[in-house]
């Protein structure tokens, strides 16, 4: 999906009002020194591409993020504010239902959500020019 035509300001508002709080709740008890952000993004469409990938694509050691509150709110925001996004997700959602697993917060998941927090920070404030 190409995120270029999303309403970025509306997504940013959804992030600040709810998604960010759910991310913080998920990470509560984790040391702020624990994870270095290794995934980065250069502009808002790129940030949303990376956010979608990390939130909804199961990875080795962390298969359960899509059912977390922040993920459901992310999905809702993208569905509302990115034209045509919902249609692209129907097949992916059906495939995910088939391999649904119980929620387990692993260290790998915590690391992944730490990366997500970093991506959302950069989505929120994509203002830097390279020197």
């Amino acid at each position: 999906y190409d995120f270029t035509n999303c309403d970025f300001e509306k997504i940013k508002a959804a992030y600040l009002s709810t998604i960010s709080k759910d991310l913080i709740t998920y990470m509560s008890g984790t040391k702020s020194t624990e994870f270095n952000n290794t995934v980065s993004c250069s502009n808002r469409p790129h940030c949303l591409t990376e956010i979608q990938s990390l939130t909804f694509n199961p990875t080795a050691g962390c298969a359960s993020l899509a059912k977390e509150m922040f993920a459901m709110k992310t999905k809702a925001a993208l569905a509302i504010w990115c034209p045509g996004y919902s249609e692209t997700q129907i097949n992916a959602t059906q495939a995910m239902k088939k391999r649904r697993k119980r929620k387990v917060t692993t260290n790998k998941c915590l690391e992944q959500v730490s990366q997500l927090q970093g991506l959302w920070r950069r989505f929120n404030r994509p203002l830097l020019k390279q020197q």
Epitope: E9, A13, Y15, L16, S17, S20, I24, S32, T33, E34, F35, N36, N37, S40, Q117, G118, W120, R121, R122, N124, R125, L127, L128, K129, Q130, Q131
Partner: antibody
Amino acid sequence: QVQLQQSGAELVRPGTSVKVSCKASGYAFTNYFIDWVKQRPGQGLEWIGVINPGSGGTNFNEKFKGKATLTADKSSSTAYMQLSSLTSEDSAVYFCARESEVGEGFAYWGQGTLVTVSA
Amino acid sequence: DIQMTQTSSSLSASLGDRVTISCRASQDISNYLNWYQQKPDGTVKLLIYYTSTLHSGVPSRFSGSGSGTDYSLTISNLEQEDIATYFCQQGNTLPYTFGGGTKLEIK
């Protein structure tokens, strides 16, 4: 806990330059932007600019372009601001501040560095 | 640049009072309004971001509200440790700009 430790007060001559440091601890240095803010005696706060310690990317308030240079040293988790061609207008307390967890607002501040420009 | 105006440069109140500090932006800032506390020794703390979200560790007696161009910070039950100068800051448009500050004093 998150801490930003700034270098000590500086008394400098007009026309020279000064470099203020801001050593970060208690968090992953490259994960968060660091902003710099100016406060003249008895006055309000002015945003100077921001650096991404991970990439070295910067952005400035137009008013401080050519005046301030922002850099960061990942190995020592230290951000720097150099001020050049100093005049009495540059006499102020300078703060470094780290952005919040969500990237909105300046969540953690250094104690400030007083720069006095005087002949 | 967006101008941020804090109409009261100083306010006097008694301990236990409810205190409201106001801040006005020269244009709509879409709730991207943050509040800071600067103690007499110069230390600065973030209190509230995005109009009404309390930063971690900030007492619940602090609250923020507003929209468009008009915003306010309320301290519901003034304590001695709240004696400080309070600044608003807009994060909507570069360059970020601050209000002139409101110094809170005890009657």
